[in-house]
């Protein structure tokens, strides 16, 4: 979380933003809110890029105003109009590509005064691992798939019943480059597995940490999927 | 509660062929796998054959492959194992069980009707 307060004394406002991630080729949202105004056409928003000259967005009497607008963000950017009356001034940035990553200043201006905070953006590639059961194997195998990751992840399995267990020595990853030369499919297949037992195929990189859970039993295979994004700090 | 009742075993010569059955209730006969098992008289139990929920993907035995086809009739919550060319060494009870997967340890499995006995003698 990073806060940050206007450099002129008494006429600052409080902004606020949060660290987060873009997974590339989807939408992402850089977030950023403030203490709200009465009236929207008192209120200035402007998002920066450090390292970039024109402007990432800007938003001013109510309206989009682009005329400034940096060329890569061209047609990628929007803020939720309807809640900047509220103090949201975050942005919604379509199709995250990799040179999006970086520092970003949100930069409010409000009839109470100015305010700024930055906030530290970035980008590769996550998705949730589905572990199954493999039959073609020639003994009791699961197979953890993630289509997307990027960059390469760290892929470890874990066991409810043997807990802290080394499963290296009977597991095998593989990364294979997806279309677009830059995200990979992760393959995870673990062997000589056993019923009545939770495992865990647990991926991650420096930017998210998913988990895929299997347990088979005689009568049911229960599967569970969940993904976190790591380093959200707010500013 | 599940049920298994196998049948269609009996008497046949070395290079003969039989048709078992296993009919199958008290469970949602589309969600398992089916497998067939058969023990020798006096030794252990040894996994013969699997079929998916389905019945697109099927697996068998070494000493099987080749002799022995495993089908399901969904709609009649039924499992069948064609043999054909039986040996002597196929003479065993054989029994069907069920399997949320195609894992085919004998240890797994939990349900067992009573078996039907298949001899091969001349």
């Known amino acids: 979380l990073i806060i940050g307060f206007g450099i002129s004394g008494r006429h600052s406002i409080t902004v606020t933003t949060v660290a987060s991630a873009g997974n590339i080729g989807e939408d992402g949202i850089l977030s950023c809110t403030f203490e709200p105004d009465i009236k929207l056409s008192d209120i200035v928003i402007q998002w920066l890029k450090e390292g970039v000259l024109g402007l990432v967005h800007e938003f001013k009497e109510g309206k989009d105003e682009l005329s400034e607008q940096d060329e890569m963000f061209r047609g990628r950017t929007a803020v939720f109009a309807d809640q900047v009356i509220v103090g949201n001034a975050s942005l919604r940035l379509k199709n995250v590509q990799l040179t999006d990553a970086g520092t970003y200043k949100c930069y409010i201006i409000t009839s109470k005064g100015k305010g700024n905070a930055n906030l530290e953006y970035k980008t590769g590639a996550f998705s949730m691992p589905e572990v199954n059961v493999d039959y073609n194997a020639s003994s009791e195998t699961l197979r953890c798939e993630a289509p997307r990751w990027f960059p390469q992840p760290t892929v470890v399995w874990a066991s409810q019943v043997d807990q802290g267990a080394n499963f290296s020595e009977v597991s095998n990853t593989s990364f294979e480059l997806n279309s677009e030369n830059v995200t990979m499919k992760v393959v995870s297949v673990l062997y000589n597995v056993t019923i009545n037992n939770t495992y865990s195929c647990m991926i991650e990189n420096d930017i998210a940490k998913a988990t895929g859970d299997i347990k088979v039993t005689e009568s049911e295979i229960k599967r569970r999927s969940h993904l976190q994004l790591l380093n959200s700090k707010a500013s | 509660e599940v049920q298994l009742v196998e049948s269609g075993g009996g008497l046949v010569q070395p290079g003969g062929s039989l048709r078992l059955s296993c009919a199958a209730s008290?469970?949602?006969?589309?969600?398992?796998?089916m497998h067939w098992v058969r023990q020798v008289p006096g030794k252990g139990r040894e996994w013969v054959s699997r079929?998916?929920?389905?019945?697109?993907?099927?697996s068998y035995e070494d000493s099987v492959k080749g002799r022995f086809t495993i089908s399901r009739d969904n709609a009649k919550n039924t499992v069948y194992l064609q043999m054909h060319g039986l040996r002597a060494e196929d003479t065993a009870v054989y029994y069907c069980?069920?399997?949320?997967?195609?894992?085919?340890?004998?240890?797994?499995?939990?349900?067992w009707g009573q078996g039907t006995l298949v001899t091969v003698s001349s």
């Open positions: 079929i998916s929920p389905d019945g697109s993907s099927t």
């Open positions: 069980t069920r399997f949320s997967t195609g894992w085919h340890r004998i240890e797994y499995f939990q349900h």
């Open positions: 008290g469970f949602t006969f589309t969600d398992f796998w």
